[in-house]
Interface confidence: low
């Protein structure tokens, strides 16, 4: 071992450096001292450090470490925060479009229903938004409430418009009859399945992204232990006590110190990897009825079909309801259902193919690809931090925590450190409580993500086929399908171009007697070109 170089005879360099950390020189010896009170930078000879300086170095070292950790996670944190915000906003926009399409369908096809239909549609989509954001709302109840509310209005306005106001207490009976007589056929059940599956997946996707932010925030703001502070001080600052201002720590030594300091954080690695892979699996399955964009933007069409189903069976229904709700109705009123030949009994629900621009689906896949580049983020952290702090290349002529060495030897360094602190002991302490908590949250979300991962291939439930509904003609290579209607496929040019303004607000919503209903902008109308005889809301 080469002897330590003689310290600066006046401690001048140390004084000028330390003054940058702590204005005032009262703690810095003018000339080297024995340093018998030092606890971290244990001297092999005279030293330019005092106990107070050591404490300041420890504080600075821990702050440096926190800053390095924060800059290490900055890109990842920004990626998740930005995407969580983008997706949350995008989902709100999808909900708004879906509401507008549905309102437009009512306005154009069933104007007599509009004042109240707008209200029910508004309430339904409000609940959809709240559910996505985590509210404790039952999707089946939402759908039931929509159809329960719609049927009395359909019955009194379309099927039996002669009904006087005095007979309005028929509503309660009509709500009950709606379910008992399955007046909308299997459409409510179809919508329940599609909406609940797609919203569940959407909700957990957002939850997972928000947890990702929480994980990064937790590790970003970790307070490092005193032991770690001592190790960092020894690595970064103890060389100064010997007047070695330009010497860099050995790379191998830095890795050992960082692994010791980050032992708890690195424990997240296993669960973080699983989180990204589970999220990828979820995203890969978010298509057809598991894609809220497809499901919600196609709802207007399914609701339209459901009303046609009622109208088709209006004759039979009016008679049955007349008997069923006789106590609410003194006499039968003229029935105004449409001639049956106007309606096609569709056994197969056609599905619509969405033309890709920048869809939510492609945005999700892009996010997963970027996240996968951070899959080893936690296991690579010690190495990352060492590579972003000053270390000697090739471990030659570098500081090993005690002295300047020509070549770093981990074994020698460990032996030399034995009496000062125990790296192994530092690792054995286990993660901090906050890290343990975040690991538990990761375990929980990973479990949820796994249970939510969708089957590949045909995804529409068999139980929806009872009344001849089928999943339609979407091939496996087409991963954007909407439960639609009509005799041909609806071509829906995708609305969600992320960098576009996206402020489309048809706003035929919510109020009875809205005298200022805006019409869709021209570019929105062109969205529904070449529709043939399909029931587009904007025709």
């Amino acid at each position: 071992q080469p002897p330590p170089p003689p310290p600066d005879a006046t401690c001048h360099q140390v004084r000028s450096f330390f003054q940058r950390l702590q204005p005032g020189l009262k703690w810095v010896p003018e000339t080297p001292v024995p340093g018998s009170d030092l606890q971290v930078c244990l001297p092999k000879g005279p030293t330019c450090c005092s106990r107070k300086m050591e404490e300041k170095y420890q504080l600075t070292a821990r702050l440096n470490m926190e800053q390095l950790l924060q800059s290490a996670s900055m890109e990842l944190k920004f990626l998740i925060i930005q995407n969580a915000a983008v997706f949350q906003e995008a989902f709100e926009i999808v909900v708004r479009h879906a509401k507008n399409y549905t309102n437009a369908m009512f306005k154009n096809n069933y104007p007599s229903l509009t004042p109240q239909a707008f209200e029910f549609v508004g309430e339904f989509f409000t609940d959809v938004s709240l559910y996505i954001l985590g509210s404790d709302i039952n999707v089946d109840d939402m759908v039931n409430e929509l159809f329960d509310s719609l049927f009395p209005v359909i019955y009194t306005q379309l099927m039996n418009p002669g009904l006087p106001d005095s007979a309005l207490d028929i509503n309660e009976c009509l709500r009950g009859a709606r379910r008992d007589l399955k007046v909308f056929g299997n459409f409510p059940k179809l919508i329940m399945t599609q909406v609940s599956k797609s919203l569940q997946v959407t909700r957990i996707f957002l939850q997972a992204l928000n947890l990702g932010i929480e994980v990064i925030n937790t590790t970003d703001h970790l307070k490092f232990s005193k032991d770690c502070g001592r190790m960092l001080t020894r690595m970064w600052y103890c060389s100064y006590c010997q007047g070695l201002m330009m010497v860099k720590p050995c790379g191998g030594y830095c890795n050992v110190v960082m692994q010791g300091c980050m032992a708890g954080v690195v424990e997240i690695d296993k669960y973080w990897r699983e989180y990204i892979l589970s999220l990828e699996e979820l995203v890969n399955g978010m298509y057809r009825i598991y894609d809220m964009e497809n499901v919600l933007l196609g709802l207007f069409s399914t609701i339209h079909d459901s009303i046609q189903y009622v109208q088709k069976n209006a004759g039979k229904l009016t008679t049955t309801i007349g008997k069923l709700c006789a106590h609410s109705q003194q006499r039968q009123y003229r029935s105004a259902y449409y001639p049956e030949d106007l309606f096609i009994d569709k056994k197969v629900l056609k599905v619509a193919h969405v033309e890709h621009e920048e869809t939510l689906s492609s945005r999700r896949r892009e996010l997963i690809q970027k996240l996968k580049s951070f899959i080893s983020f936690y296991s690579a952290l010690p190495g990352y931090i060492c590579s972003h702090s000053p270390v000697a290349e090739n471990d030659t002529l570098c500081w090993n925590g005690q002295e300047l060495v020509e070549r770093y030897s981990q074994k020698a360094a460990r032996n030399g450190m034995k009496n000062q602190f125990n790296l192994h002991e530092l690792k054995m302490k286990g993660p901090e409580p906050v890290v343990s908590q975040i690991i538990d949250k990761l375990k929980h979300i990973n479990q949820l993500l796994r249970t939510m991962s969708m089957p590949k291939g045909r995804v529409l439930d068999k139980n929806l086929d009872e009344e001849g509904f089928e999943s339609g003609d979407c091939g496996d290579d087409e991963d954007e399908c909407i439960g639609g209607s009509g005799d041909g496929m609806i071509k829906v040019k995708n609305q969600l171009r992320f960098l576009a303004e996206l402020a489309y607000d048809l706003d035929v919503d919510d109020a009875p007697g809205n005298s200022q209903q805006a019409t869709p902008k021209d570019n929105e109308i062109s969205t529904f070109h070449n529709l043939g005889n399909v029931h587009s809301p904007l025709k």
Partner: antibody
Framework: EVQLVESGGGLVKPGGSLKLSCAAS????????MSWVRQTPEKRLEWVAY????????YYPDSVKGRFTISRDNAKNTLYLQMSSLKSEDTAMYYC?????????????WGQGTLVTVS | DVVMTQTPLSLPVSLGDQASISCRSS???????????LHWYLQKPGQSPKLLIY???NRFSGVPDRFSGSGSGTDFTLKISRVEAEDLGVYFC?????????FGGGTKLEIK
């Protein structure tokens, strides 16, 4: 024509109870979310309670939570407000009003009001 | 709770004049869905309030087009282009973006 007619107001002692009713006609009551709004003697308006169209959801501001209960009987086209543990600051004209939904509602139609005096 | 502040408290006008009432909220009324739920009501003497304008600028059914609403975020205005005798009364602004719903203190429109 939409009509909302409140009743049940009157003079009551602090700590007492009162039940207000609102009879609706001229529209499909069952399909509307409903609210009670009160107007203080100083003419300030305060939202008091909300119930969704099917009656499944109710909401109250903190000032009345635990003391007031909103309910509806869709068969009778009637809205109710059960008020208990009344305080002098509950003195107001109470209006029933129809609205769309909690998150995006506005009070489209109002009754003529019923006066509650707590003294 | 969101505090709604109306100015002026009283607004004396001559018939045929333009009137303008201001309403300011203590926080933004832009809902996460992009809509702004700021509404205006008129209470004529001896009557219950009536809805005039919903969502900043939409006139309710039967409301004359001399009434218009504008504004965004936290600052909103109700304008009456030519005041008529039947417009006299107390005007209230109200928000339903945040629960609980809250109202402004009112602005009394009266004849000079």
């Amino acid at each position: 024509e939409v009509q909302l007619v409140e009743s049940g107001g009157g003079l009551v002692k602090p700590g007492g109870s009162l039940k207000l009713s609102c009879a609706a006609s001229g529209f499909a009551f069952i399909t509307y979310g409903m609210s009670w709004v009160r107007q203080t003697p100083e003419k300030r308006l305060e939202w008091v309670a909300y119930i969704s169209s099917g009656g499944a959801n109710t909401y109250y501001p903190d000032s009345v939570k635990g003391r007031f209960t909103i309910s509806r009987d869709n068969a009778k086209n009637t809205l109710y407000l059960q008020m208990s543990s009344l305080k002098s600051e509950d003195t107001a004209m109470y209006y029933c009003a129809s609205l769309s939904t909690l998150v995006r509602g506005w009070f489209a139609y109002w009754g003529q009001g019923t006066l509650v005096t707590v003294s | 709770d969101v505090v709604m502040t109306q100015t002026p408290l009283s607004l004396p006008v001559s018939l045929g004049d333009q009137a303008s009432i201001s309403c300011r909220s203590s926080q933004s009324l832009v809902h996460s869905n992009g809509n702004t739920y700021l509404h205006w009501y008129l209470q004529k003497p001896g009557q219950s309030p009536k809805l005039l304008i919903y969502k900043v600028s939409n006139r309710f059914s039967g409301v004359p087009d001399r009434f218009s609403g504008s504004g965004s975020g936290t600052d909103f205005t109700l304008k009456i282009s030519r005041v008529e005798a039947e417009d006299l009364g107390v005007y209230f602004c109200s928000q339903s973006t945040h629960v609980p719903y809250t109202f402004g203190g009112g602005t009394k429109l009266e004849i000079k």
